[in-house]
């Protein structure tokens, strides 16, 4: 079954190369086991960032190499990636699966387009 | 279009094993997760596994966790569902599945295995 997944148009990274954006979808029941996928689309490929799955009010658990971090609070889901840099700009999309309890649901959002400026290194002060 | 063929289904009693397949004859599945889902009568269609065909990663239900596994073949092209330890609650029509890509859904579906569990 299909499920509508909201996300910002666009997001800044910052000087840091810290992006955080919302995702959030529309639950027809109450999902007590979710599971996330972020999704990176640049030059027509897709490839997959991170992958989290949560138990309701609980943090997202990815893996430990992950470059994301998140948490939940009722159907939003609050995604930040870490380490950016200029080349990882690009559209990336918010996959979400209602895992359980039955009936199983899956969306995928429209994609938060996230610009990322390598900081200018400082000048060499004498 | 891709045709998932299930096999496998069948009577058996508690604490049994059965192992189901499924088939998509002439095609690769190459860029595709595919998984195993269950319905009981009257219920919603439930999650029970899939595995991405790229790297073989894994992802389990709870209620089967420990005791089903699921496996690919690609020389077969085939996907597995070994269940073990069977329990009448695990008694539905198991339906294949194939996404056909990560912007996907659940695009591709077999026609469903009967999988009775008895006390």
């Known amino acids: 079954k299909a499920m509508h997944v909201a996300q910002p148009a666009v997001v800044l990274a910052s000087s840091r190369g810290i992006a955080s954006f919302v995702c959030e979808y529309a639950s027809p029941g109450k999902a007590t086991e979710v599971r996330v996928t972020v999704l990176r689309q640049a030059d027509s490929q897709v490839t997959e960032v991170c992958a989290a799955t949560y138990m309701m009010g609980n943090e997202l658990t990815f893996l430990d190499d992950s470059i994301c971090t998140g948490t939940s609070s009722g159907n939003q889901v609050n995604l930040t990636i870490q380490g950016l840099r200029a080349m990882d700009t690009g559209l990336y999309i918010c996959k979400v699966e209602l895992m359980y309890p039955p009936p199983y649901y899956l969306g995928i959002g429209n994609g938060t387009q996230i610009y990322v400026i390598d900081p200018e290194p400082c000048p060499d002060s004498d | 279009k891709v045709q998932l063929v299930e096999s496998g289904g069948g009577l058996v009693q508690a604490g049994g094993s059965l192992r189901l397949s499924c088939a998509a004859p002439g095609r690769t599945f190459s860029n595709y997760a595919m998984g195993w889902f269950r319905q009981a009568p009257g219920k919603g269609r439930e999650f029970v596994a899939d595995?991405?065909?790229?790297?073989?990663?894994?992802y389990y239900a709870d209620s089967v966790k420990g005791r089903f596994t699921v496996s690919r073949d690609n020389a077969k092209n085939t996907v597995y569902l070994q269940m073990n330890s069977l329990k009448p609650e695990d008694t539905a029509v198991y339906y294949c599945?194939?996404?056909?890509?990560?912007?996907?859904?659940?695009?591709?579906w077999g026609q469903g295995t009967q999988v009775t569990v008895s006390s």
């Open positions: 595995i991405r065909w790229s790297d073989g990663r894994t």
């Open positions: 599945a194939a996404q056909g890509g990560v912007l996907s859904g659940w695009d591709y």
